[in-house]
């Protein structure tokens, strides 16, 4: 089942997911000055069953110069287009998603396609969070989001991370303020505040967290 | 929570225009496309054509370039269309969607008379 | 453009029975179709997108299946809120078209 919105937004990150469940969708979007062909799909599917999945549909992006189509739109700032959810500063390391039943890998790119991936998450994924380059995490808790179905609606959870600036100066746990979940309370209420300057150990915790949820994922 | 708030309903004179709009919340606006759909008693659900936001592009289906026009207002998360020369075949309720199908508005009612 | 029908305009079932829409596409269309269910003076509501991968919130008694030309949406285990118009559609090809519809009548 398809989640009704997208993983939260999170100041200063990035989310990524190791693998797609099936049913997701990535939508063909185009790099500027490219478009969809009209004929081409909408989006890539994740599709299959419990022992293979792929991809299916291929996305086609044509110059848009070549079509008649007028821009009535008003344009967005690229500053603005800060969080890429598929582009990782230091790419964390993945799993074998060939051993994750039901699962896609991550699709590989398509002639001129832009350069932010749109993906629909179903029921069940998760995505991991990550501070972009020239800022450091705060840890209260996983950087990392679910996407849970409860009373027959979807809802993210809320990844306990804070990306600062390094020129900043952290606060100390003390004096921290807690990170809400939509519920207005921390979802890890025992969860203690972990400050890590190293890049590479975030990584690495974050891959080694990773295999750990998909396997528990199907317990 | 991801939503598609359409304009309120039109009472219009034939041979005028009308424009209405849809606006988005809940979603990265300039993210997905937004279509727009008629649906008029007896003639089913037509594909107007949609516009990407944040691409700048448009797309009309052929039988109804000319009638309609598609924009987006990226400042303000919203899309319009706009119906022109209106007669009574235009009289129906519109749909803006988006999400890949999965959000409808609530509709718009269009009624041309004189 | 792709045409799509529905061929059956009305279907009557009862509460507990199990009951198929059929759709076909006038060309091939892969997996790129959408079911939808329309209540009376409600807005479509998207059920299944992809020929049978079902949207959030809507009950498994819901299935969609086919491919290529052929599509079904079987109901199983009708409820009576189930009374609704249900018209598929394909985005495969553009323009996008829509079936006619088939309304579900509870007995």
């Known amino acids: 089942e398809l989640c009704d919105d997208d993983p939260p937004e999170i100041p200063h990150a990035t989310f990524k997911a190791m693998a797609y469940k099936e049913g997701t969708m990535l939508n063909c979007e185009c790099k500027r000055g490219f478009r969809r062909i009209k004929s081409g799909s909408l989006y890539m599917l994740c599709t299959g069953n419990s022992s293979h999945s792929s991809w299916d549909n291929q996305c086609q992006c044509t110059s848009s110069a070549t079509r008649n189509t007028t821009k009535q739109v008003t344009p967005q700032p690229e500053e603005q287009k800060e969080r890429k959810t598929t582009e990782m500063q230091s790419p964390m390391q993945p799993v074998d998603q060939a051993s994750l039943p039901g699962h896609c890998r991550e699709p590989p790119p398509w002639e001129n396609e832009a350069t932010e991936r749109i993906y629909h998450f179903v029921v069940g994924q998760m995505v991991y969070y990550q501070c972009v380059q020239g800022y450091r995490a705060l840890h209260r808790g996983p950087a990392e989001s679910v996407c849970k179905m409860t009373h027959g609606k979807t809802r993210w959870t809320q990844p306990q991370l804070i990306c600062t600036g390094e020129m900043e100066t952290s606060q100390f746990p003390g004096e921290e303020k807690p990170q809400a979940s939509p519920e207005g309370r921390p979802e890890s209420e025992t969860s203690c505040l972990v400050t890590t300057t190293d890049f590479q150990i975030q990584t690495e915790m974050a891959a080694t967290m990773e295999t750990s949820i998909f396997t528990t994922e199907y317990q | 929570q991801v939503q598609l708030q359409q304009s309120g309903a039109e009472l219009v004179r034939p041979g005028t225009s009308v424009k209405m709009s849809c606006k988005a919340a809940?979603?990265?606006?300039?993210?997905?496309?937004i279509g727009w759909v008629k649906q008029r008693p007896g003639h089913g659900l037509e594909w107007i054509g949609d516009?990407?936001?944040?691409?700048?592009?448009?797309d009309y289906n052929e039988k109804f370039t000319g009638k309609a026009t598609l924009t987006a207002d990226t400042s303000s998360s919203t899309a319009y269309m706009q119906l022109s020369s209106l007669t009574s075949e235009d009289s129906a309720i519109y749909y803006c969607?988006?999400?890949?199908?999965?959000?409808w508005g609530q509709g718009t009612l269009v009624t041309v008379s004189a | 453009d792709t045409t799509v029908t529905q061929s059956q305009k009305f279907m009557s079932t009862s509460v507990g029975d199990r009951v198929s829409v059929t759709c076909k596409a006038s060309?091939?269309?892969?997996?790129?179709v959408a079911w939808y269910q329309q209540k009376p003076g409600q807005s479509p509501k998207a059920l299944i997108y992809?020929?049978?991968y079902r949207y959030s919130g809507v009950p498994d008694r819901f299935t969609g299946s086919g491919s290529g030309t052929d599509f079904t949406l079987t109901i199983s285990n009708v409820q009576s809120e189930d009374l609704a118009e249900y018209f598929c559609?394909?985005?495969?090809?553009?323009?996008?078209?829509f079936g006619g519809g088939t309304k579900l009548e509870i007995k």
């Open positions: 969607v988006s999400r890949n199908f999965a959000k």
């Open positions: 809940g979603y990265t606006f300039t993210n997905y496309w």
């Open positions: 516009i990407h936001p944040g691409g700048g592009y448009i």
């Open positions: 060309q091939n269309v892969g997996t790129n």
């Open positions: 992809s020929a049978s």
């Open positions: 559609q394909q985005y495969n090809s553009y323009p996008y078209t």
